[in-house]
């Protein structure tokens, strides 16, 4: 939708004559008829397909035409159209003499025509006027014209409708090409989406107006990056919503039990971290190199039994050294010079040759382990039974005798709400008086541990000997890149360098 505008500027008819050459009496009272139509190579009479417009009497014989937008838009003349502008046109402008006040075509004698001009060509939509002058033997007409789009229409053809708005359906103004230009603070195809406060957490926060940051349930703070603890939590905090991680000196599911042993007695030695683990009980987390209930004992590097195949360990100032029994060598006596011919497998283990007899492997009977089947399996050493269950060795297997209220292979299940295993991803289920609560493993959060969150597996500095730690984001595990001279999954073993 748009408007073809024609601005008449000057008409010259010095002799005051009609097209027939007959003079007007007393002078040529001149008005104009304009016909706008589709492009024709030769402009011919016929329907004015794009519209027509007539003026009142504008002057006598020769006159200049004043701009007059106030009087109903008389000059420039307006020819509105309700279609896509084709870019080409034909224009016919006729000057007529009005003997009386009735300007209708049927009220005028046919020889009242003063002059007729016809032009055709290309015309692009734009604000600039095109100036033209048409001359005949007796008259001259100077005029200019242009095509502009109607309000809310844009583009090369006035075919793009765009109406600026600032409401629920959009917040934008229109560019000259009809594309939307969002108001400050808004984005999206129709500028309906507010731009939240800078730094507002992408998952935990949202906004309903620009520069706002509203938090989803369970999150708080200016940027929605702080969690809210569980409703029943008393003396605790959280790292994910609805958790209740107890403050120092407090215990219980809702951190409402006063457990001040650490604060009152400071039992942990050698810079260890003390954690209250129950009423009047505590746990010391030792710094590297210390052990014991209260971390009171200095740890020998040989205590981890690094020497294999019966090798004996000797502490050294900068680590340890393995003295290997006959037939074994290597940093941890892990390599064997024996073969099956030496009957190296104990406790009824069967020997299998490897590498054309250069090496061997022992297949151990039940209850025995070690590279030579030299160790008796104690399946209870790892304390597999949870919730105070008692571990019993039963020949080649083990079983847990559970305390009342618990069940499962390892007494890990609370008999009641937790029986249906509601906690996902290995979350631990706790029965409450009414309901249950899940304690999630690292990397998971949510009411039922259903939400996977990225964790930094390197945060605990698991790599030794100045190795570089990398986090594998797909599995939330770490990989240690060892410096020269060290091996092991944590770069914990020095290599015997030549």
């Amino acid at each position: 939708s748009g408007v073809f505008q024609l601005q008449l500027q000057e008409f010259i008819n010095e002799r005051g004559v009609l097209a027939s050459g007959r003079p007007c009496e007393p002078g040529c009272r001149t008005f104009f008829r304009v016909c706008l139509k589709h492009f024709q190579a030769v402009v011919s009479p016929g329907p004015c397909t794009f519209g027509t417009v007539s003026t009142p009497v504008l002057g006598t014989n020769s006159f200049a035409v004043r701009d007059d937008s106030s009087g109903g838009g008389r000059n420039p003349l307006q020819l509105p159209f309700n279609f896509t502008w084709p870019g080409t046109f034909s224009l016919i402008i006729e000057a007529w003499h009005a003997p009386g006040d009735d300007l209708r075509p049927e009220a005028l004698p046919p020889d009242a025509l003063i002059s007729k001009i016809a032009i055709q060509g290309s015309l692009a939509v734009g604000q600039n006027w095109l100036l033209d002058e048409q001359t005949s033997t007796l008259t001259r007409l100077r005029y200019s014209y242009r095509v502009i789009c109607s309000d809310n229409y844009y583009g090369d053809n006035c075919s793009r409708l765009c109406k600026k708005r600032n409401d629920h359906f959009g917040h934008y103004v229109c560019q000259p090409d009809g594309n939307l230009s969002c108001l400050p603070g808004w984005t999206g195809e129709y500028c309906q989406q507010p731009i939240c406060l800078s730094g507002c957490h992408e998952q935990n926060g949202y906004c309903s107006k620009p520069a706002e940051c509203l938090c989803r349930p369970g999150w708080q703070g200016r940027l929605c990056n702080e969690c809210i603890p569980h409703n029943g939590c008393r003396h605790g905090t959280c790292s994910t919503p609805w958790q209740c991680t107890c403050d120092e000196g407090w215990g219980g599911l809702f951190c409402d039990q006063d457990l001040n042993y650490c604060t009152h007695h400071s039992p942990c030695k050698n810079g260890a971290t003390c954690s209250n683990s129950g009423q009047r009980s505590y746990t010391c987390t030792c710094r590297p190199g210390y052990t014991g209930v209260d971390c009171e004992l200095e740890l020998s590097e040989c205590d981890s039994n690094p020497c294999r195949n019966g090798g004996s360990c000797k502490d050294q100032e900068d680590g340890y050294h393995c003295l290997c029994p006959p037939g074994y060598y290597g940093l941890h006596c892990e390599h064997s010079t024996l073969s099956c011919a030496d009957s190296p497998c104990f406790n009824g283990g069967s020997c299998r040759e490897r590498n054309q007899g250069a090496n061997y492997a022992c297949e151990c009977p039940p209850n025995f382990t070690g590279s030579n089947c030299e160790k008796k399996v104690d399946r209870c050493t790892s304390n597999p039974c949870a919730n105070g269950g008692q571990c019993l060795n039963r020949g080649p297997s083990r079983m847990c005798r559970c305390r009342p209220g618990f069940t499962g292979t390892y007494c890990e299940l609370h008999v009641s709400d937790c029986a249906r295993n509601p906690c996902a991803h290995g979350g631990t289920c706790h029965d409450l008086e009414n309901g249950l609560m899940c304690t999630c493993p690292a990397g998971f959060s949510g009411r039922r541990c259903e939400v996977r969150t990225s964790i930094d597996a390197c945060a605990s500095s698991p790599c030794f000997n100045r190795a570089t730690c990398y986090t594998d984001l797909s599995t939330d595990t770490f990989v240690c890149n060892c410096p020269y001279g060290f091996v092991g999954s944590r770069c914990e073993f020095p290599v015997g360098l030549p």
Epitope: C215, Q220, G221, E226, P229, R234
Partner: antibody
Framework: EVTLRESGPALVKPTQTLTLTCTAS????????MAWVRQPPGKGLEWVAT????????YYRDSVKGRFTISRDNSKNQLVLTMTNMDPVDTATYYC???????????WGQGTTVTVSS | DIVMTQSPDSLAVSLGERATINCRAS??????LAWYQQKPGQAPKLLIY???NLADGVPDRFSGSGSGTDFTLTISSLQAEDVAVYYC?????????FGGGTKVEIK
């Protein structure tokens, strides 16, 4: 036991200022977001304002924005609501509650009556 | 703002009988709904959160159900001490909004 105790009742004139104080005990006050909720006489509950525990971010219902200010003093375990340019429509029982705008209000004070009348 | 509509406005139930209160949200609030009990002259008390989780110390005759826009509070066997006004509240969208309340009396 969790206890929230609001300061005593008050009668104020329109346009005047009133400050309510809530003193908390039985939980680690600094760990939890807090709120004020009010109840006009014979009517239902309406949330008034909230303050976070982490950074003290505040939020208000539209009708009190610019007039009410919520703040907290963690060292004193106190929540404060300062109400300026008070209007008779602010007449209500004001409750101090533990919670945010996006979590349940787990614990409530006994409430204090505020009457705005000339 | 989300409008919470409770029904009925009041409810008279015989002792030991079941009482059911409904709450409807004007748009989806998922399961982020709480129920409160307010006895005459007292402050409100949290009964249920996240639609169906009982708050600490609440008797198990109270239960909640629903999701999205329609929610229900049920008292399976009404006791004399349950006479109160019950309010629902959504905390999914800002600002939090309460229902108008349902008064529960003994028939």
């Amino acid at each position: 036991e969790v206890t929230l105790r609001e300061s005593g009742p008050a009668l104020v004139k329109p346009t005047q200022t009133l400050t309510l104080t809530c003193t908390a005990s039985g939980f680690t006050f600094s760990n939890f977001p807090m709120a004020w909720v009010r109840q006009p006489p014979g009517k239902g509950l309406e949330w008034v304002a909230t303050i976070s525990s982490s950074d003290g971010t505040t939020y208000y219902r539209d009708s009190v924005k610019g007039r009410f200010t919520i703040s907290r003093d963690n060292s004193k375990n106190q929540l404060v609501l300062t109400m300026t340019n008070m209007d008779p429509v602010d007449t209500a029982t004001y409750y101090c509650a533990r919670g945010y705008y996006n979590s349940p209000f787990a614990y409530w004070g006994q409430g204090t009556t505020v009457t705005v009348s000339s | 703002d989300i409008v919470m509509t409770q029904s009925p406005d009041s409810l008279a139930v015989s002792l030991g009988e079941r009482a059911t209160i409904n709450c409807r949200a004007s748009e989806d609030i998922y399961s982020n709904l709480a129920w409160y009990q307010q006895k005459p002259g007292q402050a409100p008390k949290l009964l249920i959160y996240d639609t169906n989780n009982l708050a600490d110390g609440v008797p198990d005759r109270f239960s909640g159900s629903g999701s999205g826009t329609d929610f229900t509070l049920t008292i399976s066997s009404l006791q004399a001490e349950d006479v109160a006004v019950y309010y629902c509240q959504q905390y999914n969208n800002y600002p939090p909004t309460f229902g108008g309340g349902t008064k529960v009396e003994i028939k």
